[in-house]
Interface confidence: medium
């Protein structure tokens, strides 16, 4: 039996299609401001967006098994539709100006449309034909259409106000919508032609749906749900009154989700997404930044990309021809991300959270979350404040500085402590970057009145000051072993400089229009940096051919940036510390001749076997 479903801020309700029946709330907890609504009839589930929580959720019709399926990177997800054949979820976000897709459980998320979108609002799917339709509310309101993979985009209805409630009559092949500027209910054929006004005397129609011979709509002025004949607009009936702010309305019935396409059968044999395209075809789609393999069925994860962090988010960006948009990685419980790094071998992301005073790691999909360094060591009555980190991928160690103890620590990637490698009465090590290819680490030392940039062997020995003049607050370091260059940003002097790894050939790379540089990274021939005050990522071509370029603007609360290059496994295995840490119990160092020597943290000494460390 068909019935109406509608979202009304803090609840989602159902009501009979007939008049004067009571509406019944679906027992859902934690709904704050439900906006868009849709269903999957075969699963007997409803899906909704919440513009206060900035989530997309689902539950069974009885309210059970409530779960958030998308909870990152949403701003105002005000349009949403279920692809019942491909088992995909589509949504439009007026804040991010993106139309995205994922599986119904939120997996394999991809951005389909992101260029030249101005406040996309209502969204409707025609999966049997392979088209999606949406309205835009921006400077030039319109109704657009594209294939369900985002291709073949075209404007169908250019001369329209803010169109809402976009609905498809699948049987008669017509589009219906409400116009919030003209207060009309209109209809057209599937090409936007043959346009007809169905109702022109309504005070404020908002949401709209169609079922059999009727259209059903909500009216914000009359505070009602009403219906009328879908072609003539006659035989009007109020289904229910006294309803404020009904956001979306739909008819729950299997006839609204019929048809067939290739995606309905074994996901089109696609490894990730199966996306319908006209007419009746499909393409396999990949999660954001993944690439489709030559078999046109399976996908490969990106191996080269940029990570950048904001206060409570870590984002990934790829540099490609399509100018693919950056995405937020679905990592929970980020409070105040200060620094990030990446292990390309295990494909794990590492970060320092300065609110929780810990170092954590996780996979890019948010799974396998693990605390590597905890905020306090009760047995030693020791509070720590990690400041910066750098991974030695060969020895599988993290080098990290601590604001509370003013030392450089080494911890295994599995969280076991190696020990302190650098500690001094006057020392205040802050930024740190390791160069395990040569056996060195570089760090900024923000001593009172005499900031320095220093170099030391990875065990803290062979320590030397590279720079002590022309520095005020060197806040960030980056290193490129291939180029043999060290880079640093000084947030007080507002400039970015570089030198050779020995400290020779110091030059100022950029010192104009930099306000608050807080992070640096090298990516191919480009040096990228983030400016927290200008909320911007910029880059400069180190070959001098292309100069300085803005990469992205309007990114609030930036904290760090890190380039990830594809790991050459053959090269990796040739590093003498890559095999079982070179046989060393603690620190493995590469000597100038390419051989290794073992060493120890400060509290231990090297034993006679020259491999193991023990108590002095």
């Amino acid at each position: 039996e068909a019935f109406l479903l509608f979202s009304r801020r803090a609840d989602i309700r159902r009501i009979s299609l007939e008049t004067n029946n009571n509406n019944v709330a679906i027992p859902l907890t934690g709904v704050k401001e439900a906006s868009a609504l849709d269903f999957d009839v075969t699963d007997n589930r409803i899906y909704w967006t919440d513009i206060s929580l900035k989530t997309i959720s689902r539950a069974f019709m009885n309210g059970s098994a409530l779960e958030h399926v998308v909870e990152f990177g949403l701003d105002y997800p005000e349009g949403m539709a279920v692809d019942w054949l491909g088992k995909n979820l589509y949504w439009a976000d007026t804040g991010t100006n993106r139309i995205e897709v994922s599986k119904l459980d939120g997996q394999h998320r991809q951005v389909l449309v992101w260029k030249d979108l101005d406040s996309p609002r209502a969204l409707a799917l025609d999966p049997a034909e392979g088209f999606m339709y949406w309205t835009e509310w921006g400077g030039k309101p319109k109704i657009d259409r594209a294939a369900m993979d985002g291709s073949e985009r075209t404007t169908l209805v250019p001369n329209v106000g803010r169109a809402n409630g976009l609905t498809i009559d699948y049987a008669k092949r017509r589009l219906y919508w409400t116009d919030l500027d003209t207060n009309l209910i209109e209809s057209s054929n599937m090409l936007g032609l043959n346009r007809e006004v169905i109702a022109d005397d309504l005070p404020h129609p908002f949401g709209l749906t169609q079922y059999q011979d009727y259209i059903y709509w909500t009216d914000w002025s009359r505070r009602s749900i009403e219906r009328a004949n879908k072609t003539s607009g006659q035989n009007r009936t109020i289904i229910q009154g006294h309803l404020d702010y009904v956001m979306d309305i739909l008819v729950f019935h299997s006839s609204r989700q019929s048809g067939w396409n290739e995606c309905a059968s074994s996901n089109g044999h696609c490894s990730h997404l199966c996306l319908a395209v006209p007419v009746g075809g499909f393409v396999c789609g990949c999660p954001a930044h993944y690439s489709l393999n030559a078999d046109n069925r399976t996908c490969s994860a990106p191996t080269t990309f940029l990570l950048f962090s904001q206060k409570s988010a870590i984002n990934r960006m790829v540099i490609d021809e399509q100018q693919s948009p950056d995405i937020i990685l679905p990592i929970h419980s980020l409070r105040n991300v200060r620094a990030i790094d990446y292990d390309p071998l295990d494909k794990q992301l590492y970060w320092i959270d300065s609110r929780q005073n810990m170092i954590r790691k996780a996979q890019e999909d948010g799974s396998q979350g693990f605390t590597v360094v905890v905020s306090s060591v009760p047995s030693q009555n020791l509070e720590i404040q990690p400041y910066d980190l750098s991974i030695d991928i060969y020895s599988r160690y993290i080098y990290w500085t601590c604001e509370a103890t003013n030392v450089i620590n080494v911890t295994r990637l599995d969280g076991r402590s190696v020990g302190v490698v650098l500690k001094g009465e006057q020392d205040r090590p802050r930024a740190v970057v390791v160069n395990p290819e040569k056996g060195y680490m570089y760090f900024t030392n923000l001593q009172e009145r005499s900031p320095k940039i220093e170099r030391a062997a990875l065990d803290g020995t062979e320590r030397e000051v590279l720079f002590f003049s022309g520095l005020s607050k060197p806040i960030a370091l980056a290193l490129d072993s291939r180029l043999g260059k060290l880079f640093w940003a000084d947030s007080d002097l507002r400039r970015i400089e570089s030198s050779d790894l020995s400290g020779a050939n110091r030059i100022v790379l950029e010192d104009s229009n930099i306000l608050q540089p807080v992070g640096l990274t090298v990516f191919e021939n480009w040096l990228y940096w983030i400016d927290k005050q200008q909320q911007m990522i910029e880059k400069i071509d180190m070959t001098g051919r292309e100069g300085r370029t803005k990469v992205q603007a309007r990114i609030a609360q930036l904290s760090d940036i890190h380039a990830v290059k594809e790991l050459n496994l053959q090269e990796y295995r040739q590093h003498p510390c890559a095999q079982d840490n070179g046989g060393c119990s603690h620190i493995c160092l590469v000597k100038g001749d390419g051989t290794t020597r073992c060493s120890c943290p400060m509290h231990l000494v090297l034993l006679q076997d020259e491999l193991s460390c023990g108590e002095p």
């Epitope: 801020r9 401001e33 906006s35 513009i51 206060s52 105002y76 007026t94 804040g95 100006n97 101005d118 406040s119 509310w137 921006g138 400077g139 803010r162 919030l180 500027d181 207060n183 404020h204 702010y245 956001m247």
Partner: nanobody
């Protein structure tokens, strides 16, 4: 983010006119309710006029009906308040406010512009 900048305030004689403008930046200015509030000296802030994205919906405070007119130009992301037949009791700091028509998820305020009506 939506940022609001008011202009057009000033000193005017009773019976005179002023036109306030509220310029908005931000991608979704056109889908917000825009309102003018005022904060008279020694009193509470009060709603003067509101215009919804649906242009037919306009509300005025009883004290300004027939004298003030609110209008919006979505293309220019600007909302105007035409104030005629001003009275000394209209003296206040006038603020522009932008709020989503549904729910309390977002609300923005301008810095305000001073209107002084002398008798």
């Amino acid at each position: 983010d939506v940022q609001l900048v008011e202009s057009g305030g000033g000193l005017v004689q009773a019976g005179g006119s002023l036109r306030l403008a509220c310029a908005g930046s931000g991608r979704i200015f056109a889908i917000y309710d825009i309102a003018w509030y005022r904060h008279p000296p020694g009193n509470q802030r009060e709603l003067v006029a509101m215009i919804r994205p649906v242009v037919t919906e306009i509300d005025y405070a009883d004290s300004v009906k027939g004298r003030f007119t609110i209008s919006r130009n979505n293309a220019m992301k600007t909302v105007y308040l035409q104030m005629n037949n001003l009275k000394p009791e209209d003296t206040a700091v006038y603020y522009c406010n932008a709020k989503r028509p549904w729910g309390s998820a977002d609300e923005y305020w301008g810095q305000g512009t001073q209107v002084t009506v002398s008798s």
